[in-house]
């Protein structure tokens, strides 16, 4: 039977090395065996390149195309082929369809003043246009309570977020994930980073007097544990000293 495209290709670029196009066929298709996506930069002397698509689902195909470091003027001509049959033809401008790379290496560290320091890495090298354009969304959720979640927008430059332990339930396990977008490029959101999980422990300090540091913190690495021990010792002494004066 004839091969038809149900939903035409939708493409996004990470604006550094890769563009990804996805489309849906009208019936289950072996994408890599039956289809080819050709792409060519509209630039004098540019060669034609071919992308072999892969299946995402039975009838959904996806093609990842290596591109050079994108610039605003770049426009690609795309042609979707089934053998000698041209199924679809269109153009794609990476700078107008940006989906940032996923932020990486999300970690949670105990910090001074009963805060958790969430850190992640900017997925772009400093010389890339997007490096200084990214803002982030951090989602923090209670692993055992779907109603208990918070969303933080990080609009400043550094890929960090300070989170007061008191804003989270004590003794609960929390997961955080982060995604990025580039406002000036009117981008879509990146995919979410893998989640990182930690155990939150917070009680009002009045209840801590005379109590040992609780065990749940042992889930932290030794460096983090030392940091929080020192921070809590200092704060405990300050707190105690404060009460003596009054």
């Amino acid at each position: 039977g004839s091969v038809k495209v149900l939903h035409e290709p939708s493409c996004f670029s990470d604006y550094i090395s890769t563009s990804v196009c996805q489309w849906k066929m009208d019936h289950p298709t072996n994408c890599s065996a039956e289809l080819r996506l050709s792409y060519q930069l509209d630039f004098m002397g540019s060669e034609n390149h071919t992308c072999v698509p892969e299946n995402r689902e039975d009838s959904v195909c996806v093609c990842s195309m290596p591109i050079d470091d994108a610039v605003e003027a770049d426009v690609y001509q795309l042609d979707l082929w089934a053998g000698q049959q041209l199924l679809w033809s269109g153009s794609f401008q990476p700078s107008k369809h940006v989906k940032p790379r996923t932020p990486g290496n999300l970690t949670v560290h105990p910090n001074i003043s009963h805060t958790w320091l969430l850190m992640w890495t900017n997925p772009y090298p400093t010389e890339n246009h997007l490096h200084s354009e990214l803002t982030y969304m951090v989602n923090v959720s209670n692993d055992n309570d779907p109603e208990d979640f918070k969303v933080y927008n990080v609009t400043y430059m550094g890929p960090t977020l300070r989170l007061a332990a008191s804003t989270l339930k004590s003794g609960a396990s929390y997961s955080a994930r982060v995604r990025a977008w580039a406002q000036t490029y009117n981008s879509t959101w990146s995919d979410w980073s893998p989640s990182t999980t930690w155990l939150n422990y917070y009680e009002p300090w009045e209840q801590h007097l005379g109590k040992p540091i609780p065990n749940p913190l042992l889930g932290l690495d030794s460096t983090g544990l030392n940091d929080i021990f020192e921070a809590q010792k200092i704060e405990w002494h300050e707190h105690h000293h404060h009460h003596h004066h009054h």
Epitope: M44, G45, S46, E47, V71, D74
Partner: antibody, heavy 125, light 112 residues
Framework: EVQLVESGGDLVKPGGSLRLSCVAS????????MTWVRQAPGKGLQWVSL????????YYADAVKGRFTISRDNAKNTLYLQMNSLRAEDTAVYYC??????????????????WGQGTLVTVSS | DIVMTQTPLSLSVSPGETASISCRSS???????????LDWYLQKPGQSPQGLIY???KRASGVPDRFSGSGSGTDFTLRISRVEANDTGVYYC?????????FGQGTKLEIK
């Protein structure tokens, strides 16, 4: 040493044909687009045609479109210009030159960085 | 087609002085930040052309730093400082951005 050597220039009558060759050495020929540029006696430079590294893309000046064909044999490191239906105004020295690097997605450009010595084509009755 | 216009068409300069040649294009040659597709070539008497400057300001291999290119968009300049007798010839600007590639008319530099 990077070098281009043209040949094939001759005296030909109007309406006649000629094939110019340009043999390249000293660089990876297939990775680069190649260009033909001509210069009529006492005149300036005029671009004629360009071909991508694989030979898959060709471009022509309006003055020669439909009459001239650029091609290449990467196995022989040779660029060609087939010239048909020649006219008096095609009289010129024809130069081949190394153009942009086309093995990358966006061609990398370093100018026409090597030129041949030129071959003279004279179209006259 | 992109039209390239050079000024002046001829120039006479004493040795040691600076020569400036202007080139204007009918369309912007700025493809992306820092990438102006404009070249300068020199054709010495009886010789093939040779590349001097590409992408507006980058010197071709082996070209002395007396030669410098500047400008962006549609207006470009070639400067030759401390001119020498060997610099005699015709200077051409060229745009390699769009087909057809187009050259300026040429500027003839004469050393007094």
């Amino acid at each position: 040493e990077v070098q281009l050597v043209e040949s094939g220039g001759d005296l030909v009558k109007p309406g006649g044909s000629l094939r110019l060759s340009c043999v390249a050495s000293g660089f990876t020929f297939r990775d680069y687009a190649m260009t033909w540029v001509r210069q009529a006696p006492g005149k300036g430079l005029q671009w004629v045609s360009l071909i991508s590294g694989s030979g898959g893309k060709t471009y022509y000046a309006d003055a020669v479109k439909g009459r001239f064909t650029i091609s290449r044999d990467n196995a022989k490191n040779t660029l060609y210009l087939q010239m048909n239906s020649l006219r008096a105004e095609d009289t010129a020295v024809y130069y081949c030159a190394v153009d942009r690097l086309t093995k990358t997605i966006r061609p990398q450009y370093y100018g026409l960085w090597v030129w041949g010595q030129g071959t003279l084509v004279t179209v006259s009755s | 087609d992109i039209v390239m216009t050079q000024t002046p068409l001829s120039l006479s300069v004493s040795p040691g002085e600076t020569a400036s040649i202007s080139c204007r294009s009918s369309q912007s040659l700025l493809y992306s930040i820092g990438y102006n597709y404009l070249d300068w070539y020199l054709q010495k008497p009886g010789q093939s052309p040779q590349g001097l400057i590409y992408l507006g300001s980058k010197r071709a291999s082996g070209v002395p730093d007396r030669f410098s290119g500047s400008g962006s968009g549609t207006d470009f300049t070639l400067r030759i400082s401390r001119v020498e007798a060997n610099d005699t010839g015709v200077y051409y600007c060229m745009q390699p951005l769009q087909s057809p590639l187009t050259f300026g008319q040429g500027t003839k530099l004469e050393i007094k």
